[in-house]
Amino acid sequence: RAVPGGSSPAWTQCQQLSQKLCTLAWSAHPLVGHMDLREEGDEETTNDVPHIQCGDGCDPQGLRDNSQFCLQRIHQGLIFYEKLLGSDIFTGEPSLLPDSPVGQLHASLLGLSQLLQPEGHHWETQQIPSLSPSQPWQRLLLRFKILRSLQAFVAVAARVFAHGAATLSP
């Protein structure tokens, strides 16, 4: 078990699941990669979702010194995105297509966050109320932006776990 505040993570297992997350995130919205959504937002909105940043200890040196800081950051982000994908932003109208990978993506986020969960702590998933946009086109745009930022987040997480599996596994 990977454990913010505990022992060493199952790096290889985390690597495999994070790799799967990358694939799912891109298949959930493959066109997302062709647009720069920073144009849509501004300096303020870039803070809205969790990012893995320089001070989070996710660099090779930081992981070697104490991987818990980085793992905690990844854990927080996974939980945030897992809740987001389970919220009315994604469950409301317009309905997702039956074969949409968002459901799988949601489940995989939950799976990886549970791998990174401290022993004896059980995260309860719940439907979170939110001020979801009233217009379907606004909701679609919001989904698009969320998936774009999730792609960036899981790409960094996958690199972290790949490095951990290669250099930090027992």
Epitope: G41, N47, I128, S130, L142, I146, S149
Partner: nanobody, 118 residues
């Protein structure tokens, strides 16, 4: 429906401090951002600072290092600690809520007056 109630405004001398509070009720979640805005007489309303559900903060240039935005543990009240106040900080301060990744704020409070005298 969301209700926002601001308090803590008043008259203060330049260099002084004030702490504004914004009490939010209704369906606020971690997918919302709460921002403090201000409007000085004859000027457009501007964003001062904002805070997300995961406690990431944003400040406009003119208040960086002087103002601090924070929230209580229950995440229902947001504070704006204003230090080293200047006469140009005089304005009506409004609390507002928006959805993450959207620039438009959806719900607004009534505002609280802050006057900084020289």
């Amino acid at each position: 429906e969301v209700q926002l109630v601001e308090s803590g405004g008043g008259l203060v001398q330049a260099g002084g401090s004030l702490r504004l509070s914004c009490a939010a009720s209704g369906s606020i979640s971690e997918f919302n951002v709460i921002g403090w805005h201000r409007q000085a007489p004859g000027k457009e309303r501007e964003l001062v600072a904002s805070i997300t559900g995961h406690d990431s903060t944003y400040y406009t240039g003119s208040v960086k290092g002087r103002f601090t935005i924070s929230r209580d543990n229950a995440k229902t009240t947001v504070y704006l600690q204003m230090n080293s106040l200047k006469p140009e900080d005089t304005a009506v301060y409004y609390c507002a809520v928006r959805q993450i990744l959207r620039r438009e704020y959806d719900y607004w409070g009534q505002g609280t007056q802050v006057t900084v005298s020289s």
